[in-house]
Each structure stands twice: as C-alpha cells, then as structure tokens.
C-alpha cells in the first residue's frame, strides 16, 4: 500500500526527530504550544494542525512551535497538599488511597483473568483449525511455512505456550524434527505479541494516549518480526540454534525437575475455571492426526474421572499386528491379541458456566470472546482512570523518575539491561509474557513509562517466557525431556540473538523507531491500527501459507518480486532521506506516484465512508463499547457519551466547539472530565497520594 502516509513535497531533514537513548527524560510540553488533536477539519475555530505522521526513515522539517508528540504528559496535581489538610481530610484521603489501591488491584485481577478467558475463547473459536495447521506435512521441508503456522496457531489460540507444547509433543512423537520445529517456535514468538496489540486498541479514545500505547505494544511485534527476518535465514543456512541447543542438551545429564511454579495462575484460576475449562489435549491430538479428536469438544465437561486399566481381546489383521508373539492366538477364523485398554469412568462434572449448555465450541468461544473483550476493555479503562487519578504531582514524578531515569554516568548503559532483567523476572512471576506486556501497555499509554524504557522490559519479557518453558521442559517426562528442553532452549537463544541484534547499540534499536512511526500513523488514522493487526497477523501469514501449499515455485514466483519491490522502496527512501542529490529530480520525492499510493488520506476517505453510518450512533453506546466504536468511526468526541449525539448534530451545523487536548489540563482526570468521560467531581477533593 502506501510507502508511508502523506509525504507530499516534504523535504528531508536528518537532524530532526531522532530518538534518544533509552531512558532519556523528555521535557514536558509547553502549554502555549499545544496541538489540537481533535481532527475536526471543518470547524470554524482556528487551531494548530495535527502533527503529520513521521515514518521511521523520513525525517521532516516541521514548524518549530510543534512539540514532540512522544514527550510524556505532565501529570500535575490539582488537589490540596497533604500538609494543608485537617485530620478528617487526612483520614479521608488515606482511606480514599486504600480504596483506590483495592480497586486498582481488583481491576488488574479481572484484567488478567479476562486475558486468560480471551485465550480460551480464541482456542474454542480457532483451536481445532490451529491443530489442523500442524498436521500439514510440508512443515518438514519448508521453514517459511513452519514460521507462518507458528504465527497463525499462536494468534488463533492466543497462547505461545499452547502452540509450543503442541510442537514439543510432536517432536517427542517423532512427527516433527527439531529442525522443522525451530521456525514454528519463531512464529509462536511473533504470534504471542498480538495480545498486547489488542490491549492497545482499547486505548483508542485519546489520540496521544493511543499513539504511545500502540507504539509501546507494537515495539514487541517489530522486535519479533525483525528478529525472524534476520535469524530465520541464518538458521536455515547454518542451523546454529539447533546445533548449540543440541550440544547443551547432550552435555548435561538432566534429571526430571519440578513443575514450573504457577504463581499468577494460583490467584486467577479459581475465578477463570468458574467461567470455562478447556481440554487442551484435544488441539494436540488434532495436530497429531488423531481423527477421533476432531469430533471432541474443547469444553471440559468431566473434571473428576476414574481411569481403570484393563485388558481386552481384540482382533488383528495378521499375527504380525499382535502386541507380542506370546499374546497372540486364533479362533480358527480371526487372529486375536490382548490390548491394554484404559476405561475412563466419569465421576464428577466440572463447575463452570458452560458445563450443562452443550453448546458448540464456536458458540461458547464467540460468547467468551465478546465478554472477555468487554471486560478487558472495561478493566483497562478503569485501570487507566485510577492510575490517572493516583499518578499525579509528586507520586507521578517519583514513579516516572524511578522507571525512566538512567543510572549515573558511566553506568547509564546498564539501565536497559537491568530493565531486561526486570522484564524477565516479572514475566517469570506472572508466567506469561502476554500478561506482562499487556499490563505494560496502558502504563505506556498514560505516560508513566517511555517507549525507550518499555522496549527493554518487553525484551526481558521475551526472555522470561522462555525460562518458564525451560523449567516446564525440565519437569516433563523422560521421553519428552530432551525434545522439550531443546525446543525451549531454541526459543531462549532465538530471543537472546534478537536482543543482541536489536538492543546493545542504540543505532540498531529499529523496533522503537518503527513502532513510533506506526504510532504516529495510527494516532492520525485510527483504523490503520486494525488494518495493521489484520495484515501482519492474519493476511500475510495466510498468504504465505496458501502460497507454500501451492509449492516452492509459486512461493518463490510471488515472493521474490514482492521482496524486490519492498527492498527497492526502502533503498529509495533511504536515498531520499540521506542523499537525495544522487537521485534524479523526479525520484527525490514520491510525488510521481498517484496519491493513493503515497498517502493514507484517500484510503481514510474510503474508510470514513464505510464507517459514516456509525458516526451518529457511535457515542450513544455504553461507555465501554464507546472506545471500540471510536476506533471505527474516528469520532472526535467519542468518549463523552452523555451529550455526544447532540454535540455531533451541532458540529454538523457548523457550531463546533474545539475540545481541549488532554495536555492543556492540569491532570489527566480533569482532561477526561472536560471530555465528558468522567462525571465531573470537585477536583479539590482529589487525593494526591496513597
């Protein structure tokens, strides 16, 4: 599509908008130079134009009065200072703080639970299809197919651990070689990064918040995609991951360890198992070509079963099929053998909502998908609101400084590595990179964590999830120990390699630049975020999957020209930004291309036409749905909800009143009140510290 959005006649200027090192402290925006982010193009009121979306490579001359949109907002305190309060006020403030903390933890709990249920919903909707992806025999010979299968399966089941465990069981059963499994693991790494991208979509209501949240989430995507882009060809050529991990596995005499500690699951499971319980073995069985599993439901019905082993006589085609020569006989017509049969006797049903409904998996999955997304969205909004009211003034300053400030010179470079360790540790504690990165996303959105700091935390999260896998591997039974350990180590070394590629040298931190570029685009054209999600996690993998099935020739025939065009565009962009004089005048900018090929504006018009019908209604829906609607309709006052429809009608009559951007207010809570998102409250009663 567009090489980048709207670059018209822009002249490159390499000196502007370069990212600083991780942890750089950006200055607060000057209130006098505020940008209006409402995007009401036809309003009669004079306002400063929206920032154009900057790409990662093209650096544009901009009016000096416009602030860097990546600067963190100042969360100023408008409440009464602690010292000025009377005893009653202090007590009230203390209990308010405690209340907020309890609410925050409560919403955080349901947020994590909804992520778990979201994963279950995806498994119910697409789990069986995901299992069938694995039963494709071409995986063995085609690493690219393995990669996209890893992506698609993980996206469909919303869990890299599920897809990885399927791979492990297939390797243990010799249905898959470690060599063929490595690209699948790489794909699973990519697929798992969709969760926090979905979470970022929930913050669509506020442009600047969305810009940061979406960039913060997609930094994970870009890291994974770029790592695969470099490391998959390297692995195919050298098999370095396979060789290193094989040496490690063979050099140690591992004994079966303990199970990986379930720390977060201990708290969330009591609740999530009341909603739905899944029999995840079904997906593995489908992957391993078990025909009977295709008709089984993923919804677990019986939780307490009694397994009785017994021997039964069965007929076999010939004596060669007998269990053993001594367990072989004939009745004169047929050959018989004795087979060990495990009889499963159902004793007690599971205690979850869907146990007695006998609904098809797709129906249960769809219900849970909608509900979990609503809960996820609701919890996220509430977390952001509570954090917004808590993180003000001194509290905000302390937290932001603690998280985003580097160590003193000459140890500043160590800060990022500590963040990697923190990310790994936190992920190990919560046992899920999705949960950790998803929890990080709203914090990036509201401006508590910079993208530069979120990046190493995310990289650490990638490492953390592999250490969990290594522990799980050490706890696996003898026959699966070697293969599961080798695959877990492949996953680990793949992420280490990725970090070595895209982290140590600030210049190589491409994922940050790319994520910021995407954040800018998505903040201006919010529909592009959904478009990105569909393209990168569904369409591209499905296209590669389809082409791979058609055979190598078709894949190469289509792939080579596409790759060639991409390389050509990237080289041209690099030359345009670095040394445009080398190029002929016509190629010094993209004006020679039709508008739809170089700008998202025409596409935006098309999308707006399609979503126009939602504009009148989008804000009249409930507050939770509101944000989802905004994503589609690009409604400027989307989250007012109360007077929104009337305002929209007024706006159409040309009586629009500009809505102040959040940065113009003293703090986030007030900015949201002005936009009608929070019922107006007396800001004097706001409590500044817990």
């Amino acid at each position: 599509m567009a090489p980048w959005p709207e670059l018209g006649d822009a002249q490159p200027n390499p000196d502007k908008y370069l990212e600083g090192a991780a942890g750089q402290q950006p200055t607060a925006p000057d209130k006098s130079k505020e940008t209006n982010k409402t995007d009401n193009t036809e309003a009669p009121v004079t306002k400063i134009e929206l920032l154009p979306s900057y790409s990662t490579a093209t650096l544009i001359d901009e009016p000096t009065e416009v602030d860097d949109p990546w600067n963190l907002p100042t969360l100023q305190d408008s409440g009464i200072k602690w010292s000025e309060r009377d005893t009653k006020g202090k007590i009230l403030c203390f209990f308010q703080g405690i209340g907020r903390l309890i609410l925050l933890l409560g919403f955080l709990y349901f947020f994590v639970c909804s992520l778990d249920i979201l994963s279950s919903a995806f498994q119910l909707v697409g789990g069986k299809m995901a299992g069938q992806f694995f039963s494709n025999s071409s995986i063995m010979s085609n690493p690219l197919l393995g990669l996209v299968i890893g992506v698609l399966v993980t996206v469909l089941v919303q869990s890299s651990s599920t897809s990885t465990s399927i791979v492990v069981s297939m390797v243990s059963s010799s249905l898959l070689t470690v060599r063929a499994a490595i690209p699948i693991i790489m794909g699973a790494n990519i697929g798992t990064s969709i969760t926090n991208t979905i979470v970022a979509l929930m913050q669509v209501g506020d442009r600047s918040e969305f810009r940061r949240a979406f960039a913060g989430a997609t930094v994970h995507d870009f890291f994974n995609w770029l790592s695969v882009l470099v490391l998959l060809p390297v692995e195919v050529a050298t098999h370095y991951l396979e060789i290193i991990t094989q040496l490690i596995v063979e050099s140690f005499h591992f004994k079966n360890g303990e199970d990986a500690p379930d720390l977060l699951k201990v708290i969330t499971k009591p609740f999530t198992k009341l909603i739905v319980q899944l029999d995840k073995k079904v997906i593995s069985q489908i992957a391993m070509n078990d025909e009977k599993a295709k008709n089984k439901s993923l919804v677990k019905i019986w939780c307490k079963t009694f397994t009785n082993k017994t021997q039964i006589n069965v007929t076999v085609p010939s004596t060669a099929n007998c269990t053993s020569p001594s367990l072989c006989w004939t009745d004169g017509i047929q050959n018989w053998t004795m087979k060990n049969v495990t009889y499963k006797e159902n004793i007690a049903k599971c205690q979850h909502i869907f146990v007695n409904f006998h609904l098809p998996d797709l129906a249960v999955g769809t219900i849970l998908l909608i509900l979990s997304l609503l809960v996820l969205c609701g919890c996220l909004i509430m977390i952001v609101k509570i954090l917004g009211s808590v993180l003000k003034g001194q509290v905000a300053t302390v937290i932001k400084k603690t998280i985003n400030t580097d160590f003193p010179f000459p140890f500043a470079w160590l800060t990022g590595y500590l963040a990697i360790l923190v990310g790994a540790g936190m992920t190990f504690i919560v046992q899920s990179s999705s949960v950790f990165t998803s929890a990080l996303t709203p914090l990036i959105g509201i401006g508590v964590i910079t993208i530069e700091r979120a990046y190493p935390l995310t990289l650490g999260s990638n490492i953390g999830t592999t250490t969990t896998a290594i522990l799980a591997a050490l706890a696996s039974p003898g026959n699966a120990l070697r293969s599961s350990l080798q695959i877990a180590l492949c996953h680990f070394f793949f992420n280490i390699s990725g970090i070595l590629l895209w982290y140590p040298i600030p210049f190589t931190r491409l994922p940050i630049r790319m994520a910021k570029g995407l954040g800018n685009i998505s903040a201006k054209y919010r529909w592009f975020a959904v478009f990105y999600l569909i393209i990168f996690f569904f369409l591209i993998p499905l296209t590669v999957f389809g082409l791979s099935l058609a055979g190598w020739r078709v894949l190469v025939g289509v792939g080579v020209p596409v790759v060639f065009i991409i390389i050509l565009v990237l080289c041209l962009r690099l030359l345009q930004s670095r040394c445009p004089r080398v190029l002929p005048k016509k190629l010094q900018n993209w004006n020679f291309l039709p508008l739809w090929m170089r700008s998202l504006k025409p596409w935006d018009a098309v999308v707006s036409k399609f979503t126009g019908c939602f504009q009148m209604r989008c804000c009249c829906c409930c507050r939770v749905c509101c944000r989802a609607c905004c994503l589609l309709c690009d409604c400027p006052k989307c989250c007012r909800c109360s007077k929104c429809c009337e305002d929209l009608e007024e706006a159409q009559e040309g009586q629009d009143v500009p809505v102040k951007a959040p940065e113009t207010f003293d703090n986030i809570t007030i900015s949201r009140e002005a936009q009608g998102e929070v019922p107006a409250s007396d800001s004097k009663t706001e409590c500044t510290a817990l």
Partner: antibody, heavy 120, light 107 residues
Framework: QVQLQQPGAELVKPGASVKMSCRTS????????MHWVKQTPGQGREWIGA????????SYNQKFKGKATLTADKSSSTAYMQLNSLTSEDSAVYYC?????????????WGQGTSVTVAS | DIVMTQSHKFMSTSVGDRVSITCKAS??????VAWYQQKAGQSPKLLIY???TRHTGVPDRFTGSGSGTDFTLIIRSLQSEDLADYFC?????????FGSGTKLEIK
C-alpha cells in the same frame, strides 16, 4: 444341550468327491465357529479349517486348500464339508466341532465323526 | 506351521498315580494351548484351555501348566476312567495344530 450330528460312514470311489454334513442343535448356529478335523491312525489329528456361519467367512489349513470346501446353511443349521478328488490318503475320520469358548480355538463340542473310506 | 510334539506315545501308569504328560511347541505359542482326552471309539473331549483353565465339568485332578513352548498336563491321582489318549493343541497361529497324543495304559 449342544449336539452335532454327523453321518456315521461314507464309502467313496477314488477321484470322486463327497459332501459330508454336520447338523447342529441346542445353540444358535450363527454364533460359533465350526471347525473340521481329520483323524488318521498314521497322521494323527489335522485341522482342515473353520467357517463362521454368521458371515460365511472361512479359514483353511494351506494343506487342505483346494481339497476341502466348507459351507454353512443357516436355515437348516447345518455345516457341510466337501472333499474333492479323493484318494486313499483321504480315508479318515472327519470330525466337525465348535468352540463356544469365545475368541479361542479350543474346541469344546465335537460330532461323532464321519468315517470316510476311499476304495474302488 | 507350529509343530506340537508329545514325546511319549504311550505311558504305563497305575491307578492313583500322579501322571505328567508333556507337550513341546516348535515356537512360542504363549498360553494358547488346550488339552483333550479321547477314549477309544469316542470323540475328543476338551479338558483344559488357555494352558491351565479347566473346562466346565472337568475334575480338579486335571491341571495344566507351562507357557511359551513347554506345556504339561498333570493328572494328580489317576482313576481308571482316565485311561485314554491325551493330546495337546495350539491355537496361537493358523493352522491350528495338534500333538500326536499320549496313550495311558495300565501297568
């Protein structure tokens, strides 16, 4: 009770064929496999083959393939064995028998045997 | 084909004796062995199947043992009505095969 009735004796000319019967009663004919066993003083006992009357499935000892043909008539609950191109070596007592011990080849009910004599 | 060998064609015994009749298979037949008794002028009668399981109505003085290739039929205290021809049969593989038989005689 289970009974298997066989004709006492058959005298046949060399090169001719004989079809001996085994009339059953006291059980459901189609339930159990019907076995045929040859007994001679010199060769001892030899298993000829078996038929499952329910489906008509048969199984033969390789040695008797082409020599013996096993059939079953469900309507009369009778099993038959036809022996072709008889020679003096085919002179023997032929037993029909069934195995009611399901899934085994252990034969628990036997007919009285038909003595076949091949002589010109 | 599996060959069932009964080494003794005849055995001289007395009433009240403990008699052991042996049968050797040419290959492993597991426990798929049956023992029969055949009196002169009569049809065979099943005594034991699955090496050691007595058939209905068979006196408990008859016991079977063995597995794989070596099998034994033991008559604990021989009665006069037990004088007959005893033969083994394997039903491990098709064709079913029989032992040549061991005839018990009074000394």
């Amino acid at each position: 009770q289970v009974q298997l009735q066989q004709p006492g004796a058959e005298l046949v000319k060399p090169g001719a064929s004989v079809k001996m019967s085994c009339r059953t009663s006291g059980y459901t004919f189609i339930t159990y496999n019907m076995h045929w066993v040859k007994q001679t003083p010199g060769q001892g006992r030899e298993w000829i083959g078996a038929i499952y009357p329910g489906s008509g499935d048969t199984s033969y000892n390789q040695k008797f393939k082409g020599k013996a043909t096993l059939t079953a008539d469900k309507s009369s609950s009778t099993a038959y064995m036809q022996l072709n191109s008889l020679t003096s070596e085919d002179s023997a007592v032929y037993y029909c028998s069934i195995s009611t011990i399901i899934t085994t080849g252990a034969v628990d009910y036997w007919g009285q045997g038909t003595s076949v004599t091949v002589a010109s | 084909d599996i060959v069932m060998t009964q080494s003794h064609k005849f055995m001289s015994t007395s009433v009240g004796d403990r008699v052991s009749i042996t049968c050797k298979a040419s290959q492993d037949v597991g426990t798929a062995v049956a023992w029969y008794q055949q009196k002169a002028g009569q049809s065979p009668k099943l005594l034991i199947y699955w090496t050691s399981t007595r058939h209905t109505g068979v006196p408990d003085r008859f016991t079977g043992s063995g597995s794989g290739t070596d099998f034994t039929l033991i008559i604990r205290s021989l009665q006069s009505e037990d004088l007959a021809d005893y033969f083994c049969q394997q039903y491990s593989r098709i064709p079913l095969t029989f032992g040549s038989g061991t005839k018990l005689e009074i000394k």
